[in-house]
């Protein structure tokens, strides 16, 4: 014959453990059931009475199977510099991202609490690590031999192109001009591009240096961290 | 060097104000998020506001909303905060804060202090 | 009363390990922010000593490490020094504050 199915509350056999979608409250000393994604627990369980759920208030959500006193609170609405990816449900938190030509300043477990704009890079000096989801663009001087000449977060120093006869020679922040006999080869035939998009933000004026410690893997974002830039100066 | 500076603090009255700067040098001024934190005597740290980089956003502690302003100029590489209807109990030093939100408060002034007191 | 919840001291002799605990709630630690640690020393600013969890910012030993599990936190310190007599405090971000926390601080004596 089949077990005869306990309607909850019920105590449970001495060893064993509660069914899915129920708890063991231990004040009572029964299995109770849990309450449903988007409600809370209202009236906990009792010997005599089961849990009395009720739906989550405004602005408020439960995900999961539970037996919380409160729902939990939706984050803050999402700044301009964000766009909302999930809505804030009685079921579900709000997701906020940055937008494109932006980086998560502030990462959550999910989505992101404060949004900066990917640095530039400003003439005579180069992207030396391009922007994440989670990091920022880090610049770097342009070394001997080599140029750029944009405001970018996406550009890269370029090698001066070689002349037969110098008219002008190249520094960090232009390329070399050769006489009207062109170029023997041009190592620059057009801007090297990074895959990120342009951004709005001023330029540090000298590089970020690495992390001196390895990427955290505390977040569901996909890059590692770049550390906070240290010895810029200001424009 | 990374050096933030603050000044500004002294004896004040309590309803009375008062105007903190923080001269920052060393960075990139305006790519950072900055922040206020006070620390009355003999206790703990305490968040006052926090400005955007480009100053379009301010947030504040509720001990002090409507009575304290954060601003910064980007031009001059300053922050600065406006204390008003000062009470005993914002007696604290002041320390002007870069935040780099993933990475910590990273760089701290040396702090001014604030006396509110008849 | 501080959002995050710290011991008001903790202490050890030279060379033992001491840990100290930053505990949390769904709208800080436990909403995934990251906690960072401070170090102040007497008469001193703050300064940065663990962030995002567990990392070190250049300069910090090894002897300090940091950890992070669903609403709390903690700090190690391994190898006692005198020079490490200070108070530590852990901070976040708080969605409900709308704004970083700091723990109420703990003041770590070295026997």
């Known amino acids: 014959l089949p077990a005869q199915v306990a309607f909850t509350p019920y105590a449970p056999e001495p060893g064993s453990t509660c069914r899915l979608r129920e708890y063991y409250d231990q004040t009572a000393q029964m299995c109770c059931s849990k309450c449903s994604p988007g409600q809370h627990a209202k009236v906990f369980c009792t010997k005599t009475s089961d849990t009395v759920c009720d739906s989550c208030e405004d602005s408020t959500y439960t995900q999961l199977w539970n037996w919380v006193p409160e729902c939990l609170s939706c984050g803050s609405r999402c700044s301009s510099d964000q766009v909302e990816t999930q809505a804030c449900t009685r079921e579900q938190n709000r997701i906020c991202t940055c937008r494109p030509g932006w980086y998560c300043a502030l990462s959550k477990q999910e989505g992101c609490r404060l949004c900066a704009p990917l640095r530039k890079c400003r003439p005579g000096f180069g992207v030396a690590r391009p922007g994440t989801e989670t990091s920022d663009v880090v610049c770097k001087p342009c070394a001997p031999g080599t140029f750029s000449n944009t405001t970018s977060s996406t550009d890269i120093c370029r090698p001066h192109q070689i002349c037969n006869v110098v008219a002008i020679p190249g520094n960090a922040s232009m390329d070399a001009v050769c006489t009207s006999t062109s170029p023997t080869r041009s190592m620059a035939p057009g801007a090297v591009h990074l895959p990120q998009p342009v951004s709005t933000r001023s330029q540090h004026t000298q590089p970020t240096p690495e992390p001196s410690t390895a990427p955290s893997t505390s977040f569901l974002l996909p890059m590692g961290p770049s550390p906070p830039a240290e010895g810029s100066t200001g424009d | 060097e990374v050096q933030l500076l603050e000044s500004g603090g002294g004896l004040v009255q309590p309803g009375g104000s008062l105007r903190l700067s923080c001269a920052a040098s060393?960075?990139?001024?305006?790519?950072?998020?900055m922040s206020w934190i006070r620390q009355a005597p003999g206790k703990g740290l305490e968040w006052v506001a926090l400005?955007?980089?480009?100053?379009?956003?301010?947030y504040y502690a509720d001990s002090v909303k409507g009575r304290f302003t954060i601003s910064r100029d980007n031009s001059k590489n300053t922050l600065y905060l406006q204390m008003n209807s000062l009470r005993a109990e914002d007696t604290a030093v002041y320390y002007c804060?870069?935040?780099?939100?993933?990475?910590?408060?990273?760089?701290w002034g040396q702090g001014t202090l604030v006396t509110v007191s008849s | 009363q501080s959002v995050l919840t710290q011991p008001p001291s903790a202490s050890g002799t030279p060379g033992q390990r001491v840990t100290i605990s930053c505990t949390g709630s769904?709208?800080?630690?436990?909403?995934?922010?990251?906690v960072h640690w401070y170090q102040q020393l007497p008469g001193t600013a703050p300064k940065l000593l663990i962030y995002?969890?567990?990392q070190r910012p250049s300069g910090v030993p090894d002897r300090f490490s940091g950890s992070k599990s669903g609403t709390s936190a903690s700090l190690a310190i391994s190898g006692l020094r005198s020079e490490d007599e200070a108070d530590y405090y852990c901070?976040?971000?708080?969605?409900?504050?709308?704004?970083?926390?700091f723990g109420g601080g703990t003041k770590l004596t070295v026997l």
């Open positions: 769904s709208s800080n630690i436990g909403a995934g922010y990251d």
């Open positions: 901070a976040t971000w708080d969605d409900r504050v709308n704004g970083p926390v």
């Open positions: 400005i955007w980089y480009d100053g379009g956003n301010e």
């Open positions: 060393g960075f990139t001024f305006s790519d950072y998020y």
């Open positions: 995002r969890n567990n």
């Open positions: 804060v870069r935040e780099t939100g993933n990475y910590g408060m990273d760089v």
